[in-house]
């Protein structure tokens, strides 16, 4: 299953990065799982994941650094609290969970660049 | 003449971006000209330029947004005062001016990403 995502995104100076993850569904899925993975060197770690029913909202866990909205075969993902050290390749993984058959789709990754802001001068 | 430069550089939150431009000199040049070009769409504009004698310092004009140092076949370039709208591809062009023959080298460009900082809160 094909998954498209932008090649590059810049995080805002507040450490927030948003991008769209779009998938070409081969079937009529009613339950979809979206996972954001971070690839550094050959290590792949899960950043966040959410399962949603088509037509319903995308809900991440309360302590997740991700939020998102879904519209058809598009998911708008936002990652918050990013620091310069979090700069890296963020991969969108989409799984069509129900009904069977299961389908896996993995994007090529979005390179997110993060620049730490300069601290504001102390107010005297 | 081959010119190497990094593919991507992030400007600091102060709008400063630095990168190295390295060239493989086919002769014993004594006078070298370095130009930074910005490519946006199909438009190429000159950002700054400096001519230097080998072994001497690299001197840009006083009102230039660029500064730099040279060491052998390497030039360390710094561009200041960058804003988010200045994000783009910055190409390093090197010309061996003297003695003849003249040689031209153009790098593949460095994608400089710039994020505007959040304004600091007013001090009451």
């Amino acid at each position: 299953m094909h998954v498209a995502q932008p090649a590059v995104v810049l995080a805002s100076s507040r450490g927030i990065a948003s991008f769209v993850c779009e998938y070409a569904s081969p079937g009529k899925a009613t339950e979809v799982r979206v996972t954001v993975l971070r690839q550094a060197d050959s290590q792949v770690t899960e950043v966040c994941a959410a399962t949603y029913m088509m037509g319903n909202e995308l809900t991440f866990l309360d302590d997740s650094i991700c939020t998102g909205t879904s519209s058809g075969n598009q998911v708008n993902l936002t990652i918050q609290g990013l620091r310069a050290m979090d700069t890296g390749l963020y991969i969108c993984k989409v799984e069509l969970m129900y009904p069977p058959p299961y389908y896996l789709g993995i994007g090529n990754g979005t390179q997110i660049y993060v620049i730490d802001p300069e601290p504001c001068p102390d107010s005297d | 003449m081959h010119v190497a430069q990094p593919a991507v550089v992030l400007a600091s939150s102060r709008g400063i971006a630095s990168f190295v431009c390295e060239y493989a000199s086919p002769g014993k040049a004594t006078e070298v000209r370095v130009t930074v070009l910005r490519q946006a769409d199909s438009q190429v504009t000159e950002v700054c330029a400096a001519t230097y004698m080998m072994g001497n310092e690299l001197t840009f004009l006083d009102d230039s947004i660029c500064t730099g140092t040279s060491s052998g076949n390497q030039v360390n370039l710094t561009i200041q005062g960058l804003r988010a709208m200045d994000t783009g591809l910055y190409i390093c062009k090197v010309e061996l001016m003297y003695p003849p023959p003249y040689y031209l080298g153009i790098g593949n460009g460095t994608q400089i990403y710039v994020i505007d900082p959040e304004p600091c809160p007013d001090s009451d």
Partner: antibody, heavy 118, light 108 residues
């Protein structure tokens, strides 16, 4: 480090039942799908079943559909395979295997042998 | 349902030689979600290569994967004594998650 340990295999008569377990450690169990894969003596690998994440979504090979049930208890980091109406052709080493973040099976247990014989 | 065919069934080679194993799918494999596993007698399978050219952690660079669509290849550039084993391909892009019948690489 990641570890998967199967248990519950043994000799059972045709038509009887058996439950296999697979205890996982060294990773966040609920973040991974887990498969059962079997290998009959001297034969190749055959996919049996998979269970995903919170345990609601499952898939089975046609050869075991309606007879085998895969389940998991995320609080115990344990995967199960309930095998009913066993047949001689179910005789195999049963492996549990973890789904890697990018999809393949990156860690496998050592396997447990199930022999269906009268 | 995907049917995976592996060839040859057995490959007889000497240490130091190059091994080329083939895996062919009955239909195009989505996003090239194909993996290769190695299995030695009495042991569980071990992941070697996935999608279809990324090496798994700890796998030496003598192992490489290539291919797309329906035709995939596992290459062992220089066979070491420990490389003589069974090799399976598997598609993992959609259920059912089929395996190929395997190729045995044995010592000539």
């Amino acid at each position: 480090q990641v570890q998967l340990v199967e248990s519950g295999g043994g000799v059972v008569q045709p038509g009887r039942s058996l439950r296999l377990s697979c205890v996982a450690s060294g990773f966040i169990f609920s973040s991974h799908g887990i498969h059962w894969v079997r290998q009959a003596p001297g034969k190749g690998l055959e996919w049996v079943a998979v269970i995903w994440y919170d345990g609601r979504n499952k898939d089975y090979a046609d050869s075991v559909k309606g007879r085998f049930t895969i389940s998991r208890d995320n609080s115990k980091n344990t995967l199960y395979l309930q095998m009913n109406s066993l047949r001689a052709e179910d005789t195999a080493v049963y492996y549990c295997a973890r789904v890697a973040p990018l999809g393949p099976l990156d860690y496998w247990g050592q396997g447990t042998l199930v022999t269906v014989s009268s | 349902e995907f049917v995976l065919t592996q060839s040859p069934g057995t490959l007889s080679l000497s240490p130091g030689e190059r091994a080329t194993l083939s895996c062919r799918a009955s239909q195009s494999i989505s996003s090239n979600f194909l993996a290769w596993y190695q299995q030695k007698p009495g042991q569980a399978p071990r992941l070697l290569i996935y999608r279809p050219s990324s090496r798994a952690t700890g796998i030496p660079d003598s192992f490489s994967g290539s291919g797309s669509g329906t035709d995939f290849t596992l290459t062992i550039s220089r066979l070491e004594p420990e490389d003589f084993a069974l090799y399976y391909c598997q598609q993992y892009g959609t259920s059912p998650f089929t395996f190929g019948p395997g190729t045995k690489v044995d010592i000539k």
